[in-house]
């Protein structure tokens, strides 16, 4: 018991650190006054409880009274939020609070109430965010076996118990322990901002979280914002136990991918109807966003920080803006935001000087798509400024005429008519193809190089869509490029995949068929209506990943590239999928970001729809966080079953 | 739509302070330069203060040390931090900017000091 082995003191007695069989352990030596029954409560719990998210009990002694437990290498967790909060990644916060939560669950289905859960009692065995274990839960001293009706003694620690457990005398169940969670993934999310203050001032630390009148984490401690851990810390929150998740759908909300993937939830005001949106160029001093929205008589640009989240809009044009650009001209350092409206117009505007503004050449029908493209890196070689129009031209500017008011396009391509729009630009990913872009005109898929002239012209209409003929002849509305073309047509649920040399269609990714998957497991849809809300609204490439498809539904669903397997649907993620588009955005560094509608009912006898935009921030990692997370959840189950099987031996 | 909505002003005693805020709407908010004029009675407006885009500030001699103006992106809002009042400092404070066409004009808010 020399004080350099010294771990911890309680009013139980002391921790040390120690050899047992040739490993190092913790052992708990309780005070010579200790009870026989704490030691035997500690036991009992410590006895029939094994799972890789609870300190397991190697060995028991009477004389002195101790228990020999594991040692977990990396201390506690209050300990790393004190002084080593810099390891402290999204990742890691993440496993951290999924693995206590597992515990939580595990602890709760034997129907123990663990009545203390804090920082202080999370034991973390390493920071490796893919180790099977990371974290558990330790110190069952005040652990209880209740009964359904829940039980009465006034525990925990002020400033980590839930409202009901701090007023005593009145009965309390496991719930109890989703409140201290809440607390807990509070202090992970703000690394430990309130446990330094509450030292500072410790009657007023219990007081505030019983209120439920913590800070907002993000505004308060300006850490990063995590939309669906604040949703969850908020519902654990709840003062009404009965309100408040149990842990097991604690666990459930904790194990998915998109809760660690999403990292920014942006409602725009309502009935902005947002068209299209260009980010920012990543070297410029805000991760901001330009949006184009307005109805059919005017059109409204707006502009969102995104570190702010500030929202600003100003009414630019006389007829909706259908597509936006961002040119950038480093030697001039300045850019320009071009607006391509319903009516034809292409307005440029300064993007730091709402003053400097004029509009280009007309064009003969509405500006249906803007690419501004880099067939060079180097900004010595010329960029051009794409323009697609509705009556299936494509018209050609050298991107520093931008500046210049009334600037005619160097060149003007007759691809289509106005039966066939040209509706999409897009250049390829495949990096062996550098200076190829490539279009979607009526049914058509074109590519062309940098002297502008067409290499290829593929015609799409197909008898090879079997019960999706009937989009055969739909217009293309959307073309990535990658090392096959991937398309999508106007109102079919099918994205299209064709092959570049042969010019032969060579797969069909069936969205209403992944769909079905998903939803016949939850009894969601009728066919017809999965139809209709799988029709494919936007497409996005991640490099050598993945192929984002966002749907009219709502629905956002990810493919791997190489194999073209579902890796995840994400379901309802709002009424209709609009825009998404990959970005650099300062220190945000490669998101993906999606812009959805959603349709709400308003009050009253007519029965309006009211539309609000919602933009969403997600970590460009998200296909592979999925894939990681199901291997991580499977080692785990595994360890589990192993643990329970060793126990019942 | 373009919409400055000024506040803040108000009843003062000379050498006292206020400080006027001026919100901005139906613009795009930091591409700007935003102004403070004002107008006392009989007289004809002057120009108080100017923050540029990128927060620069510039004052009328008769304020210069005395008034401060600042702006928030993220509020679209202009403020002017008035100390030191002077009787002759009453007047109706405006908001302004000037954008791609004309200068925008809030309603004024009345400051008046008393001696």
């Known amino acids: 018991q020399a004080p350099e082995f010294l771990l911890g003191d309680g009013s139980f007695g002391s921790v040390y650190r120690a050899a047992y069989e040739g490993e190092e352990v913790a052992v708990k030596i309780f005070n010579k006054h200790t009870s026989l029954r704490l030691l035997r409560q500690e036991l009992v719990v410590l006895c029939h409880l094994h799972h890789p998210s609870l300190i397991s009990l190697l060995a028991a002694g009477i004389r002195p009274r101790m228990l020999v437990m594991e040692l977990a290498s990396k201390g506690s967790l209050d300990r790393l939020l004190q002084q080593d909060k810099a390891s402290l990644t999204r990742t890691l916060q993440h496993r951290i609070a999924l693995h206590v939560a597992d515990g939580l669950r595990y602890l709760h289905s034997a129907m123990i109430i663990y009545r203390d859960l804090k920082p202080h009692n999370v034991l973390l065995f390493t920071l490796y965010p893919n180790a099977a274990i990371i974290a558990k839960i330790a110190d069952y001293g005040i652990a209880q076996y209740c009964c359904r009706m829940g039980i009465k003694t006034s525990e925990g620690t002020p400033g980590f118990r839930a409202p009901e457990v701090a007023r005593g005398n009145v009965i309390y169940n496991q719930q109890a322990d989703v409140y201290s969670f809440g607390l807990l993934l509070y202090d992970i999310l703000t690394t430990g901002g309130r446990i330094v203050e509450g030292l500072k001032f410790p009657n007023e630390f219990d007081e505030l979280e019983i209120q439920g009148k913590l800070p907002d984490p993000v505004k308060e401690y300006g850490c990063a914002p995590w939309p669906m851990v604040e949703k969850l810390i908020k519902q654990c929150l709840k003062e009404n136990p009965q309100e408040r998740p149990t842990s097991a759908q604690v666990f459930d909300i904790l194990n998915s991918a998109e809760l660690v993937c999403l990292t920014r939830r942006i409602l725009l005001p309502k009935n902005v109807i947002v068209e299209c949106m260009v980010a920012t160029h990543h070297n410029s001093r805000n991760a901001s966003i330009w949006l184009g929205c307005g109805h059919t008589d005017r059109g409204q640009l707006s502009f969102l920080d995104l570190n702010t989240e500030g929202y600003t809009s100003e009414e630019v044009a006389d007829s909706r803006i259908l597509c936006l650009a961002l040119v950038h001209l480093p030697v001039e350092k300045e850019s320009w935001i071009v607006s391509g409206t319903q009516s034809g117009t292409l307005l440029v505007i300064n993007t730091e000087d709402g003053k400097k503004r004029h509009t280009l050449e007309k064009m003969t029908d509405s500006v249906t798509c803007l690419y501004c493209n880099s067939f060079s890196k180097q900004s010595k070689q010329k960029n051009f400024l794409l323009v697609g129009t509705a009556d299936g031209k494509l018209a050609i500017f050298e991107d520093k005429t931008v500046k210049l008011k009334g600037a005619a396009p160097l060149k003007i391509l007759n691809i289509g008519n106005v039966s066939t729009p040209l509706m999409c630009l897009s250049e390829s990913t495949n990096s062996t193809e550098r200076n190829v872009m490539w279009g979607g005109c009526g049914t058509k898929i074109f590519s062309f190089s940098n002297d502008f002239t067409i290499q290829k012209l593929i015609e799409t209409r197909t008898s090879q869509l079997f019960s999706y003929a009937a989009f055969s002849d739909s217009n293309i509305i959307t073309v990535v490029v990658d090392t096959a073309l991937y398309i999508a047509k106007q109102n079919s649920p099918v994205v299209e995949v064709w092959d570049k040399k042969t010019e032969k269609l060579c797969g069909l990714i069936d969205c209403v068929h992944f769909l079905r998957e998903v939803m016949v497991k939850e009894n969601k849809e009728s066919k017809h209506k999965m139809s209709y809300s799988g029709r494919v609204k936007t497409l996005c490439l991640q490099k050598n990943t993945a192929l984002w498809i966002g749907t009219g539904g709502g629905h956002i669903l990810l493919l791997d590239l190489s194999t073209r397997r579902l890796i995840r649907v994400i379901y309802n993620f709002c009424n209709s999928v609009r825009v998404m588009m990959t970005a650099q955005l300062g220190s945000l560094k490669n998101v993906m970001l999606v812009l959805g509608y959603n349709r709400k009912n308003t009050e009253g006898t007519q029965k309006q729809k009211e539309i609000q935009s919602c933009l969403t921030v997600w970590d460009i990692n998200l296909p592979h966080e999925v894939q990681n997370l199901e291997k991580h959840i499977e080692v785990r189950k595994e360890l589990a079953e192993k643990m329970r099987r060793t126990s019942v031996e | 739509q373009v919409q400055l909505v000024e506040s803040g002003g108000g009843l003062v005693q000379a050498g006292g302070s206020l400080r006027l805020s001026c919100a901005a709407s139906?613009?795009?908010?930091?591409?700007?330069?935003m102004d403070w004029y004002r107008q006392a009675p009989g007289k004809q407006r002057e120009l108080v203060a100017t923050?540029?885009?990128?927060?620069?500030?510039d004052y009328a001699d008769f304020v210069k040390g005395r008034f401060s103006i600042s702006r928030d992106n993220a509020k679209t809002t202009v403020y002017l931090q008035m100390n030191s009042l002077k009787p002759e400092d009453t007047a109706v404070y405006y908001c302004?900017?000037?954008?791609?066409?004309?200068?925008?004009w809030g309603q004024g808010t009345q400051v008046t000091v008393s001696s």
């Open positions: 139906g613009i795009i908010f930091h591409w700007y330069d």
């Open positions: 923050i540029t885009t990128g927060g620069r500030a």
């Open positions: 302004s900017f000037q954008d791609h066409v004309l200068r925008r």
